[in-house]
Interface confidence: low
């Protein structure tokens, strides 16, 4: 799903307050709800009728450093006989997510949000068939 | 996929630099790659064999303010005849994502990352059959 553009007002103080320095704000360390965890069914990437593989990208100046991308294994879907059925299509499910980028010049360290497109998994769909006029 | 705990070193300056004030860092405004967009197949939530609905939560002190959650419509999957097949299961695909939380007390505004579990869509899987010994 799409993340809208960040509104100008989001980083501003209330109108009655003195203005903040342009361009940077205070980021508290630590993560709210850091301990909550995904609880998905086991091995859904191999049990799905639209199975997928994962690849991992790693960047030490990003939080999270590890970002996992899914790739659909097939163009079609796997039927009850375990064979690929190309009358159906495996399609990726994408999500826009935020990561935190660490930037440093000498001893000056700052952070900035970065938007990343993540393919989370795949689903099996009926194809859109274009009828030739 | 899981986001690991943020390492203590992530928010620190290089060792040779003077220590930073405990608890907060500089957050640059603006979003890197803000304009990149999801380009998923059209209407996959209704064309999927494991279809889903979306609900939207809204919070003006969060970026993004709008977080969209998917809910699988069925326990089973939709077969070629458009009927639910309960020999297969529709299961949610979850993703841990980060949002930015705005906190203000009077004229003091700060920000903190928050982890949110998002259900992005659903996929159709073969059920795990538990054999009774």
């Amino acid at each position: 799903r799409k993340i809208p553009k960040v509104g100008h007002t989001f980083f501003q103080k209330p109108e009655s307050c003195p203005p903040v320095p342009e361009g940077s704000m205070k980021l508290d360390t630590g993560i709210i709800n850091e301990n909550q965890r995904v609880s998905m069914s086991r091995n859904i990437e191999s049990r799905s009728t639209s199975p997928w593989n994962y690849t991992v990208t790693w960047d030490p100046n990003r939080y999270p450093s590890e970002v996992v991308q899914a790739q659909c294994k097939h163009l079609g879907c796997i039927n009850a006989q375990g064979k690929e059925d190309i009358s159906m299509n495996s399609v990726p499910i994408q999500q826009e997510t935020l990561v935190l980028r660490r930037k440093h010049q000498g001893c000056s360290v700052s952070f900035q949000l970065e938007k990343v497109l993540v393919t989370v998994g795949c689903t099996c769909v009926t194809p859109v068939v274009h009828h030739v006029q | 996929r899981k986001i690991p705990k943020v390492g203590h070193t992530f928010f620190q300056k290089p060792e040779s630099c003077p220590p930073v004030p405990e608890g907060s860092m500089k957050l640059d405004t603006g979003i890197i790659n803000e304009n990149q967009r999801v380009s998923m197949s059209r209407n996959i939530e209704s064309r999927s064999t494991s279809p889903w609905n979306y609900t939207v939560t809204w919070d003006p002190n969060r970026y993004p303010s709008e977080v969209v959650q998917a809910q699988c419509k069925h326990l089973g999957c939709i077969n070629a005849q458009g009927k639910e097949d309960i020999s297969m299961n529709s299961v949610p695909i979850q993703q841990e994502t980060l949002v930015l939380r705005r906190k203000h007390q009077g004229c003091s505004v700060s920000f903190q990352l928050e982890k949110v579990l998002v259900t992005v869509g659903c996929t159709c899987v073969t059920p795990v059959v538990h054999h009774v010994q």
Epitope: C72, L75, S90, V91, H130 | -
Partner: nanobody, 122 residues
């Protein structure tokens, strides 16, 4: 968005071989395909490969002669064309689709390269 640049086209005699390459910048986990357009004809599907590279499809007219492959570490798609025939003469395009709706339909590919001309003639 994905940018695609094809190379490797040229003039070849019937029965000869060519290897087309397509360098992709941007996302590389899309399914990708090769399509072609002969003079005065519509674009037609040639071959497709899944994002992981596990899965390939071919038009009947090229099956057994052409091989599609990809190297995700190099962000490159390939088409090895053997036993070329005069009717293979066309501009060859590499294209990508975020989850192919329908592999055979040229209308369902969204990002296209500029094309590379393959001429098979004696």
């Amino acid at each position: 968005d994905v940018q695609l640049v094809e190379s490797g086209g040229g003039l070849v005699q019937p029965g000869g071989s060519l290897r087309l390459s397509c360098a992709a910048s941007g996302r590389t986990y899309d399914a990708m395909g090769w399509l072609r357009q002969a003079p005065g004809k519509e674009r037609e599907f040639v071959a497709a490969i899944s994002g992981s590279g596990d899965d390939t499809y071919y038009a009947d007219s090229v099956k057994g002669r052409f091989t599609i492959s990809r190297d995700n570490s190099k962000n490159t798609l390939y088409l090895q064309m053997n036993s070329l025939r005069p009717e293979d003469t066309a501009v060859y395009y590499c294209a990508t689709r975020r989850g192919l709706y329908y592999v055979w339909d040229a209308n369902d590919y969204e990002n296209w390269g500029q094309g590379t001309l393959v001429t098979v003639s004696s």
